[in-house]
Interface confidence: low
């Protein structure tokens, strides 16, 4: 082991005599450390500052050798260690453990010599500890960031961390003394320790490092700080806000609208020890997709990529745009999608007969489950019903009929938005389309629609004005269809129907003769049945017009 | 039963370079220790460099640091030593070894700690 050149080299003299301290210079070696690192091996390190060109290094030891104690003539030994700033030796060496030994680093460059603190230690029980080496595991909770880690030995060592952001320097923590807690925490690692350290979590992204020195039962330290572990990275407690827009196209054919979302997630600023390493950046943008609709189906969501183009049918969904980090999934974004106003309303197939009201529509292919979802339109808006069908067996005609009571919900008199939608794959929530959108007034519509107050005015000798209010049906989208006014002598002589564009509630009645008594009615039709006449309202021209 | 094999070993000059691999099989690579020893006749088996294969930390015997260069290939289950500037004393039988347990300190730098050995690959230096 023993030579005149290179690393690890080493020779022995006679001390006679060394200058003592520091060269007083701010260059040269400082900081020097030495330790025991495992059963046989020791080792001297320290920092330097200085041009690294051309420096040559020499670990100095002295020790009175243990034949030697009566005469106390120190003996020294000097490694060389060229440009490294670490030398590692063993007992076989010759530099006695047991015993207290002096140490210093002298810095060659060119014709000068720098000189480190000398330092003096029993080196036996000066233990260097490693960092934690393998994983260390990262939770958090209630603005705190635990960590935990393995070891095989040394339980009871004194912790710290250090810590920096993007935008701050490092700064130094406590993890406190560990305390034996029986077993790891990383699973299948039978007979180790685990040790913790708990600091506080960040609305930026963290960098952060362990080390660890050994610590006697006395409570002393009983070594130097390890070198510090690798960096720990972790994402900011709250992620920014993304700004992606959504653009929705209007339904096709096929009962879907393509959705297209723009915009870039936000970037994260991370430390320096964490640029191109796992942990501190989000690992992947996502969209969770949820459908509103159809509620009796177990609520249905999906989790694509972000960016992805959708299909979705014409139901109310919410998009949450989510970050997954090394912590889990966080919502970035928020965004709803209404349901399709229906810009057209086709008539529904739909008949009663005695106490059962029926509906129909054209089927898709087999194995389609379908979606019938009623929703009252006005007063009681989320109070939404819905019912799932899955058709046993295929109808010749091609056709889904779906029956209910006649007694109660969709027959109360009110107006219902209904809604058809249709997938082979329920569980799917973008694999819906909008089989039709329609609106139904429910109950009776011929009877609930009649039109009320209705009035008569002169206008000129031979017209009048007649006026009346609005049919309930009229708030339920293209469930009327027509009024009808009809007018007739009460001697039976003659009468006529003006037909009343469903938007007006008024019409003029001309080629009229005085002194004939007339009684007039109006009445309000559907698509399907014609409604049920007003109360007749009599008029003639000599008489007080009401 | 686990099998390490290198490859890679040879005759060289010195200041030369060498890069030797270990390929495992039936060894659950992840989280363990691996590392590469080595026996010049007549001496004792030494450590060179040892890794923890969960992240990559490295640690270097003293006679070979900033020349060899110990590294991993995950997917592969291969282990490598890259050694630089060799000198005629780095002249060895080099083995690779891995060990059993899951996780493991300090102690990497012992050979007793690995329990699994290749048959060595001879690496030759002359001055």
């Known amino acids: 082991q023993l030579g005149a050149s290179g690393p690890g080299d080493g020779c022995c003299v006679e001390k006679t005599s060394f200058p003592e301290g520091a060269s007083g210079s701010p260059l040269g070696p400082r900081n020097l450390s030495c330790y025991r690192v495992s059963k046989t091996d020791y080792e001297c390190s320290w920092q330097y500052d200085g041009p690294e060109d051309n420096v040559s290094h020499v670990l100095w030891c002295c020790f009175v050798p243990p034949n030697h104690t009566h005469t106390g003539q120190e003996r020294c030994r000097y490694f060389s260690s060229g440009p490294d700033r670490t030398v590692q030796f063993w007992e076989q060496d010759g530099i006695p453990v047991l015993s207290k030994v002096n140490f210093w680093v002298e810095s060659r460059l060119g014709n000068r010599t720098m000189k480190s603190q000398k330092i003096s230690q029993y080196l036996y029980n000066w233990t260097k500890t490693t960092p934690p080496l393998g994983h260390i595991k990262v939770s958090q909770s209630h603005r705190q960031l635990r960590m935990d880690w393995n070891v095989s030995e040394e339980a009871g060592a004194e912790v710290q961390f250090r810590r920096r952001m993007p935008t701050t320097n490092w700064t130094l923590g406590d993890c406190g003394p560990q305390v034996n807690s029986g077993s790891g925490v990383l699973g299948d690692i039978r007979g180790s320790m685990s040790e913790s350290c708990l600091c506080p979590s960040e609305n930026m992204a963290q960098e952060i490092q362990i080390r660890r020195r050994r610590r006697l039962s006395s409570g002393a330290p009983g070594g130097p700080w390890s070198d510090w572990s690798m960096p720990v990275c972790v994402p900011p407690e709250v992620l920014p806000q993304a700004k992606i827009k959504f653009l929705v196209e209007p339904l096709n054919q096929g009962g879907r609208r393509r959705l297209t979302m723009q915009g870039q997630s936000p970037q994260l600023a991370v430390p320096e020890g964490c640029r191109g390493r796992p942990g501190a950046q989000v690992k992947k943008h996502l969209v969770l997709v949820r459908m509103l609709s159809c509620r009796c189906q177990a609520q249905t969501s999906k989790t694509v990529p972000l960016g992805k183009k959708l299909n979705l049918s014409g139901a109310t969904y919410d998009l949450n745009v989510l970050a997954k980090t090394r912590f889990g999934r966080s919502t970035i974004q928020k965004w709803h999608l209404p349901a399709q106003e229906l810009t057209e309303t086709r008539a529904l197939n739909v008949s009663v007969g005695g106490n059962m009201t029926s509906m129909q529509w054209a089927a898709q292919a087999p194995g389609t489950t379908y979606c019938l979802e009623w929703q009252p339109w006005f007063q009681h808006r989320n109070h939404t019903h819905c019912t799932l069908i899955v058709p046993e067996e295929e109808d010749p005609a091609k056709m889904v009929t779906h029956s209910w009571s006649s007694k109660p919900t969709l027959e109360q008199e009110e107006c219902y938005r209904i809604t058809v939608f249709a997938s082979k794959n329920p569980k799917n929530p973008m694999l819906w389309a909008t089989v039709l959108s329609s609106y139904y007034f429910g109950g009776n519509a011929s009877r609930a629609g009649t039109p009320r107050h209705v009035s008569v005015r002169n206008q000129t000798g031979d017209s009048v004005s007649v006026e009346w209010t609005a049919s309930q049906l009229s708030t339920c989208p293209g469930v009327l269809t027509q009024y009808v006014v009809r007018c007739e002598a009460e001697d039976g002589a003659w009468e006529s129907e003006w037909l009343v564009p469903p938007t007006k509630t008024q019409v003029t009645l001309d080629g009229l003769r005085s002194r004939v008594m007339y009684k007039v009615q109006v009445r309000a039709d559907t698509a399907r049945l014609p409604g049920a006449w007003s109360h007749p309202q009599r008029f003639s021209f000599e008489v007080q017009i009401s | 039963q686990v099998q390490l094999q290198e490859s890679g070993g040879g005759s060289v000059q010195a200041g030369g370079s060498l890069r030797l691999s270990c390929a495992a099989s039936r060894y659950t690579y992840t989280n363990n220790f691996m590392a590469w020893f080595r026996q010049a006749p007549g001496k004792e088996r030494e450590g060179v460099a040892a890794i923890y294969t969960g992240d990559g930390y490295a640690y270097y015997f003293y006679s070979v640091k900033g020349r060899f260069t110990i590294s991993q290939d995950n997917d592969e289950n291969m282990l490598y030593l890259q050694m630089n500037s060799l000198k005629p004393e780095d002249t060895a039988m080099y083995y690779c070894?891995?060990?059993?347990?899951?996780?493991?300190?300090?102690?990497?730098?012992?050979?007793?700690?690995?329990?699994?050995w290749g048959q060595g690959t001879q690496v030759t230096v002359s001055s």
């Open positions: 070894a891995a060990m059993e347990r899951r996780i493991g300190t300090r102690r990497m730098t012992e050979n007793a700690e690995y329990k699994y």
